[in-house]
């Protein structure tokens, strides 16, 4: 089976059940339902999944049985629309059920919530988790899939199966260990952090497809795969791009069974043809399916072929540029992107796409000019400032990170971004700026040749979080503009924003700066978030405050928390010293 199946199936549900097996089928249907109906209780979803599974089994036994010929969207949509509390729980989403496919599925997709009103996941004691794991392993693992899927409605479903496998392995190993907590907690922390990163990366892929179209996603994929597989032929890269686009289009569209099935086929194809693709795939291809697909997705770049010819000869100096461009524009631009990307693993994907866009714009203009060759002769000179801008930005920010450390670097970014877009909600500014600040620890340790692809492509993922959160409740025209104008220019657009002079400072509210003894029992991370929340509020009250003023107030605040957390009567200390701190801060900032 290739990724594109030509053979028709009488029953799509039976076909996918047989391809995926019962365990993966059930897991993927649970993920799909939890990503659509994010507020439904676990038990309700399990019931729906069991009903769908039993139905699928009847279709496997007899593909001609009643309703077995229906599309998966029809079957799943009909099942979701049986939920009794749909109107009360989801409001207007219930209106989707009055529509016919494919409009009904599109309607469900539009109601996916990137920031659902769900309680934060609190990790129980290790013994409690191990007991639950041993008592009913299947329910325990289903609950994990459900809780992640409903909080991350665009999580890459086949990858979530891989996370669940690792989650199970962690409990299987650690619940037998002498020190269960020492074994389990670091593994769970790692899974949580990797899971958040995986969710954010996939969210960008879906945004790219849904907001900017298939061509934008394919351009991204050509650039990335050409960097990763520089020895592969252009046609090989093109084939992988086509198949990968199909996989992600399916997953982003809620077609999780098709997506998982096609991803497995793609991994199989890559491993069968690894000699033509990359020398780095050998280890990946020896692993079981879920690990294999994950490994391929993360595989390091292959070595660049020696003696690659200069690009200028055929893409600038040749008199045939316009002729070649006119004969097949997208193939010619695709080859340009492929050739440029395979020579530049040191560039970010978004930079490569900016260069390709500049090249395309130049050809569109010049090929209509009186002397095309004279017109496009200097096109590569236009690339220089585009390359230098991210290089300089990364150099400056890595220097700042090394000087300040992660927490204070995050604070610098919090101030910077709050001044740029003060209308954005404080929790969003804190979350996004904290993630932006992590670029330092993640990328600044790398040598020059790896810094830009690490940093700028990571920043694209984080800024997409800002864009999807802002889209739900738009409050800033500047954010909307940077998010919607150009996918590849989002980071330069945000970087170029200066202080918003039109912003009217927020009214001072002492309650915002009132703290209690509960801060003392928080983890270091939670305590940082409290302080960073206060910092954002401070900037919203006094956007013209200088770095020195803000630093002085934050230092006083840190000293205040430290002092009161050591006090015998913590609550009294917070009440009395807090009032003094607010007064002193107001005076220092001239509020």
């Amino acid at each position: 089976r290739g990724v594109f199946r030509r053979d028709a199936h009488k029953s799509e549900v039976a076909h996918r059940f047989k391809d995926l097996g019962e365990e993966n089928f059930k897991a993927l249907v649970l993920i799909a339902f939890a990503q659509y109906l994010q507020q439904c209780p676990f038990e309700d979803h399990v019931k729906l999944v069991n009903e769908v599974t039993e139905f699928a089994k009847t279709c496997v036994a007899d593909e001609s049985a009643e309703n077995c010929d229906k599309s998966l969207h029809t079957l799943f949509g009909d099942k979701l629309c049986t939920v009794a509390t749909l109107r009360e729980t989801y409001g207007e989403m219930a209106d989707c059920c009055a529509k016919q496919e494919p409009e009904r599925n599109e309607c469900f997709l539009q109601h996916k919530d990137d920031n659902p009103n769900l309680p934060r996941l609190v990790r129980p004691e290790v013994d409690v988790m191990c007991t639950a794991f041993h008592d009913n392993e299947e329910t325990f693992l289903k609950k994990y899939l459900y809780e992640i899927a409903r909080r991350h409605p665009y999580f890459y479903a086949p990858e979530l199966l891989f996370f669940a496998k690792r989650y199970k392995a962690a409990f299987t190993e650690c619940c037998q260990a002498a020190d269960k907590a020492a074994c389990l907690l670091p593994k769970l922390d790692e899974l949580r952090d990797e899971g958040k990163a995986s969710s954010a990366k996939q969210r960008l892929k879906c945004a790219s497809l849904q907001k900017f179209g298939e061509r934008a996603f394919k351009a991204w994929a050509v650039a990335r795969l050409s960097q990763r597989f520089p020895k592969a032929e252009f046609a090989e890269v093109s084939k992988l791009v086509t198949d990968l686009t199909k996989v992600h289009t399916e997953c982003c569209h809620g077609d999780l069974l098709e997506c998982a099935d096609d991803r497995a086929d793609l991994a199989k194809y890559i491993c069968e043809n690894q000699d033509s693709i990359s020398s780095k795939l050998k280890e990946c291809c020896e692993k079981p399916l879920l690990e294999k697909s994950h490994c391929i997705a993360e595989v390091e770049n292959d070595e660049m072929p020696a003696d690659l010819p200069s690009l200028a000869a055929d893409f600038v100096e040749s008199k045939d540029v316009c002729k070649n461009y006119a004969e097949a524009k997208d193939v010619f631009l695709g080859m340009f992107l492929y050739e440029y990307a395979r020579r530049h693993p040191d560039y970010s994907v978004v930079l490569l796409l900016r260069l390709a866009k500049t090249y395309e714009t130049t050809l569109e203009k010049c090929c209509a000019a009186a002397d095309p060759h004279e017109c496009y002769a200097k096109v590569f000179d236009e690339f220089k400032p585009l390359v230098e801008e991210p290089q300089n930005l990364i150099k400056q920010n890595c220097e700042l990170f090394e000087q300040l450390g992660e927490y204070k670097f995050q604070n610098a970014l919090l101030v910077r971004y709050t001044k740029k877009v003060p209308q954005v909600s404080t929790p969003t500014l804190v979350e996004v700026s904290r993630n932006l600040g992590k670029v330092g620890s993640k990328c600044c340790k790398h040598p020059e040749a790896k810094r830009m692809p690490c940093a700028e492509d990571y920043l694209s993922v984080v800024l997409n979080q800002l864009c999807v959160l802002h889209e739900k409740t738009p409050v800033s025209d500047r954010v909307t503009k940077c998010c919607t104008e150009s996918l590849v220019n989002r980071r330069p657009c945000f970087s170029a924003l200066e202080v918003d002079e039109t912003y009217v400072p927020k009214e001072f509210n002492a309650e915002t700066f009132t703290f209690h003894a509960d801060i003392c029992t928080l983890s270091e991370k939670e305590r940082q978030i409290k302080k960073q929340t206060a910092l954002v509020e401070l900037v919203k009250h006094k956007p013209k405050a200088t770095k020195e003023q803000l630093k002085a107030v934050m230092d006083d605040f840190a000293a205040f928390v430290e002092k009161c957390c050591k006090a015998d009567d913590k609550e009294t200390c917070f009440a009395e010293e807090g009032k003094k701190l607010v007064a002193a801060s107001q005076a220092a900032l001239g509020l």
Epitope: F234, A235, S276, F315, K323, E327, V331, G334
Partner: nanobody, 125 residues
């Protein structure tokens, strides 16, 4: 319509050299991926080397790497295969092929759309 004309085949001793040429006429975009394939008696046709006439990237099958070099002269619409350190196992009919760069894969002859008649290379003492 695209036409491909090979030349340069012949008899050569082991360790010797030959240079094959392939001249293309017709739509240049349809021939902007050009390759050399070979077929020994009783064996399947296998890819030897390919080149993009836009970009100039080259690809080789493992058994000829370091011995064969593919090159092009766009002004003459001609592709060359310089074969050095020839071995008896290189004996075959060598075919020139052309196609779209978005489709042509050296390991798969069916992805090339246009073919020459072939030229015989015999390596023997």
């Amino acid at each position: 319509e695209v036409q491909l004309l090979e030349s340069g085949g012949g008899l050569v001793q082991p360790g010797g050299s030959l240079r094959l040429s392939c001249a293309a006429s017709g739509n240049t975009y349809l021939t902007s991926c050009m390759g050399w394939f070979r077929q020994a008696p009783g064996k399947e046709r296998e890819g030897v080397s390919s080149i993009y006439t836009v970009g100039g990237s080259t690809f080789y099958t493992n058994s000829v790497k370091g011995r064969f070099t593919i090159s092009r002269d766009n002004s003459k619409n001609t592709v060359y295969l310089q074969m050095n350190s020839l071995r008896a196992e290189d004996t075959a009919v060598y075919y020139c092929a052309a196609g779209s760069p978005a489709r042509c894969r050296l390991r798969d002859p069916t992805t090339f759309d246009y073919w020459g008649q072939g030229t015989l290379v015999t390596v023997s003492s």
